[in-house]
């Protein structure tokens, strides 16, 4: 039975040109995490495999950095980075857990005036 839950940063915003850390945390399970995938809509950004380490998609290598931890750092943000991001935890023996984060990239002036999503 899958007892775990994924906690995420929820809905977040960041400034255009800035960076943001996407973080998920798996709790309430003793399952072993074997791999974490980070996806943007249907695009695979990066994988962290327990045995093989990190692999960043070459298409995103210049703007995506591994970590901290099992998280992912997005850099040089553009408005096109706005959208849904998913952390997919592969675990043994539970199976797959998925968390969702919505990122809105704002023009600097808007972000400076404090327009922010609340984390639920």
């Amino acid at each position: 039975m899958m007892t775990g839950t994924i906690e995420t940063t929820g809905n977040i915003s960041a400034e255009k040109g800035g960076s943001i850390i996407l973080q998920c945390h798996l709790s309430s399970t003793t399952a072993q995490v074997t791999q974490v995938n980070w996806e943007q809509q249907d695009q695979l950004l990066a994988i962290c495999n327990a045995d093989l380490g990190w692999h960043i998609s070459p298409s995103f290598k210049d703007r995506v950095a591994p970590g901290p931890g099992l998280g992912l750092t997005l850099q040089s943000l553009t408005v096109n980075d706005t959208g849904e991001y998913f952390c997919i935890y592969h675990t043994y023996p539970d199976g797959t857990y998925t968390g969702r984060i919505f990122l809105e990239v704002l023009e600097s002036s808007v972000a400076e005036h404090g327009a922010r999503f609340q984390i639920p």
Epitope: T34, Q35, L44, I47, N49, A50, D51, L52, G53, H55, I56, S57, P58, K61, H90, Y92, G95, T96
Partner: antibody
Framework: EVQLQESGPGLVKPSETLSLTCAVS?????????WHWIRQPPGKGLEWIGF???????VYNPSLKGRVTISHDTSKNQFSLKLSSVTAADTAVYYC??????????WGQGTTVTVSS | DIQMTQSPSSLSASVGDRVTITCRTS??????LAWYQQKPGKVPKLLIY???TLAEGVPSRFSGSGSGTDFTLTISSLQPEDVATYYC?????????FGQGTKLEIK
């Protein structure tokens, strides 16, 4: 178009070190992907040896760990394999390959290495 | 290590036939399975990755399916140029391992 080409001695004596190089053209090995070595003994299946990342960190097959070293020279856009203390069981066609999320999308033509005295 | 078992080890089929090759893994690899084609005397060529995604330039008669521990490569209508040995490979952990191969011949 990305191309990989293996080179190195075709004959190695038992107990010596096998050394091979993979020259990459059409793509910079420091720009992403992983860079793998795979071998195929005569008439047999494929065995993965290990890889080097664009950053220079390496991952090896535990069955060969201690005997294998993979390195790269980004200035020459090539990466290399060294396999020490070889025996006849290391006789194989050795392939270099480009890895994307740990599958292999581009392969070299392969080079045959025979271990014999 | 994750063990990969392909079946059959060899098979003979006629042009136009539907051909199925299976690959079973010793533990759950989710969808992280690739298939390669190696023609006699040639280099292996990536056909499919992530169980069902066709590599660039691969004919649509090839397809993949499965998840967990059981996977299938299907050729919907066998062509003479499909004579080859086919290998499965998991891309999920260390060591990366291949199946022992399935040799496909034309009747």
């Amino acid at each position: 178009e990305v191309q990989l080409q293996e080179s190195g001695p075709g004959l190695v004596k038992p107990s010596e070190t096998l050394s091979l190089t993979c020259a990459v053209s059409g793509y910079s090995i420091s720009s992403g992907y992983d860079w793998h070595w795979i071998r195929q003994p005569p008439g047999k299946g494929l065995e993965w040896i290990g890889f080097i990342r664009d950053s220079g960190s390496t991952v090896y097959n535990p069955s060969l760990k201690g005997r294998v070293t993979i390195s790269h020279d980004t200035s020459k856009n090539q990466f290399s394999l060294k396999l020490s203390s070889v025996t006849a069981a290391d006789t194989a066609v050795y392939y270099c390959a480009r890895g994307l999320f740990w599958y292999f999308d581009v392969w070299g033509q392969g080079t045959t290495v025979t271990v014999s005295s | 290590d994750i063990q990969m078992t392909q079946s059959p080890s060899s098979l003979s089929a006629s042009v136009g036939d539907r051909v199925t090759i299976t690959c079973r893994t010793s533990e759950n690899i989710f969808s992280y399975l690739a298939w390669y084609q190696q023609k006699p005397g040639k280099v292996p060529k990536l056909l499919i990755y992530n169980t069902k995604t066709l590599a660039e330039g691969v004919p649509s008669r090839f397809s993949g399916s499965g998840s967990g521990t059981d996977f299938t490569l299907t050729i919907s209508s066998l062509q003479p140029e499909d004579v080859a040995t086919y290998y499965c490979q998991h891309h999920y952990g260390n060591p990366l391992t291949f199946g022992q191969g399935t040799k496909l011949e034309i009747k």
